[in-house]
């Protein structure tokens, strides 16, 4: 009774095809699969950026898989052939491990990269990026991004620099079409002719670094004697109502009365008769049903109202503002 | 159910050109990598250069420079032009195919008999 044996997988590699991040694990089946031919082989892979503690692991009946690293580091992975149970008369067999391994032969030191990268995807529509030079570089450096998201055939280049003093110091993006709740790949090289420049690799996702616009149309409406409802709108643009928080500042007669955090375009504040003077203002940012993070917009302009009858002037604006 | 056919192989001189041709036909729903391996009796085959997902192309050791590796989809058929040809490039030149059958829901690998390219004076 002979013990079954599988050779690993052939061929196997990591092949970079310039999507600054996204790669392809690929491999071919082990030698000898004759005697299995009535078997469908399943190859257990795991991968990870040199650093990391964990492995992710993935398990296909495929010839390649493919996912996001992040190129600042090297990248290794792992692959063996499993025949299931089926096959082996009731245990699995695993293979030897064939291991490979990716980077990018970086150029450079470190201080030369970009400094500070910040972007920010404004109101969900116009995306813009922007950095420091890398320390002790001279004023021939240049620095040129580099985008890809799937659905692009190729990395495009930054059409639409921000310069100051004659370097690269920002991207403003064309529209994105299709291009949110997917990984966004950002490279951001340099030349200099006086020394090597190292890249930088970025990933995110658009739709949490979105910066929406202030909400507008503030107003107030007197509800009953000690109720007042503070009503704004969503700003003009895509973003739906249901992708909104919002945090909004209540000041009443020049002392803070309360900040509060609401999901709808309505907040109801209990008064007292006292009141001479309420202000309002309202900031948005998106919730978490449609990102994982996100950044609040500006304040809106303040919306005031003073004067002893504040409850006979709100009653007049609110029927103004229906009629 | 998967046949690929390879010819374009033969004698040539040293510093001359072949092009070699592998057409796939058969029941194969869609083509995902094509690449040429070569073989020398008693040693190991190498992968020679590829299109792999996104039409990426790679090419291994010597025949950086030297090869260009093509595709005619309509065709279903991938070209190895081979030039500046030298005695070490002298092999057995075998087609792959990693591609899903019609009747298949993963990835197969598909390899064609060989040419032999012999570079000789």
């Known amino acids: 009774d002979t013990e079954i044996k599988v050779n690993p997988p052939q061929d196997f590699e990591i092949v970079d095809p310039g999507y600054l991040g996204y790669l392809y694990l690929q491999w071919q089946p082990p030698l000898s699969l004759d005697h299995f031919k009535e078997c469908t082989v399943e190859y257990e892979l795991k991968y990870r950026n040199i650093g990391s503690e964990t492995w992710k692991t993935i398990i296909t009946k495929n010839l390649h898989y493919k996912d996001g690293f992040d190129l600042n580091k090297g990248i290794e992975a792992k692959i063996h052939t499993l025949l299931p149970w089926q096959c082996t008369n009731g245990s699995e067999v695993q293979s030897s491990w064939a291991e490979t391994t990716y980077w990018i032969s970086p150029q450079g030191i470190p201080e030369t990269k970009v400094q500070d990268m910040d972007c920010v995807y404004y109101n969900w529509q116009y995306l813009l990026c922007s950095w420091k030079p890398g320390i002790g570089v001279l004023l021939d450096t240049n620095y040129n991004l580099f985008y890809w998201y799937e659905g692009l055939d190729h990395a495009l280049q930054c059409v639409d620099y921000i310069k100051a003093d004659g370097q690269n110091i920002g991207c403003r993006f064309p529209y994105l079409e299709a291009s949110d709740y997917k990984d966004f790949y950002i490279c951001v090289n340099g030349s200099s002719e006086n020394k090597p420049i190292r890249s930088s690799y970025f990933t995110f996702q658009l739709q949490n670094i979105v910066k929406p616009l202030p909400p507008v149309y503030l107003t107030f409406t007197r509800e009953s004697s000690c109720e007042i409802k503070l009503k704004w709108s969503i700003p003009l643009g895509p973003i739906p109502a249901r992708c909104f928080d919002y945090e909004i500042e209540i000041r009443e007669d020049d002392t803070t009365l309360v900040t509060a955090t609401v999901e709808n375009e309505t907040y109801t504040l209990k008064t007292t008769n006292e009141t001479r003077q309420l202000c309002f203002v309202v900031r948005s940012k998106v919730n978490i049903y449609c990102s994982d993070d996100g950044i609040w917009s500006e304040w809106s302009d303040k919306q005031c109202w003073e004067g002893e009858d504040l409850s006979k002037k709100t009653l007049l604006r609110h029927h103004h503002h229906h009629h | 159910q998967v046949q690929l056919q390879e010819s374009g192989g033969g004698l040539v001189q040293p510093g001359g050109s072949l092009r070699l041709s592998c057409e796939v036909s058969?029941?194969?729903?869609?083509?995902?990598?094509m690449a040429w391996y070569r073989q020398v009796p008693g040693k190991e085959r190498e992968m020679v250069a590829q299109?792999?997902?996104?039409?990426?192309?790679k090419y291994y050791g010597s025949a950086k420079g030297r090869f260009t590796i093509s595709k005619d989809s309509a065709k279903n058929a991938v070209y190895l032009q081979m030039n500046s040809l030298k005695p070490e490039d002298t092999a057995v030149y075998r087609c792959?195919?990693?591609?899903?059958?019609?009747?298949?829901?993963?990835?197969?690998?598909?390899w064609g008999q060989g040419t032999q390219v012999t570079v000789s004076s």
């Open positions: 792959n195919i990693v591609g899903v059958l019609t009747t298949g829901h993963y990835e197969n690998s598909f």
């Open positions: 299109i792999t997902y996104g039409d990426t192309i």
């Open positions: 058969g029941s194969i729903s869609s083509i995902n990598r």
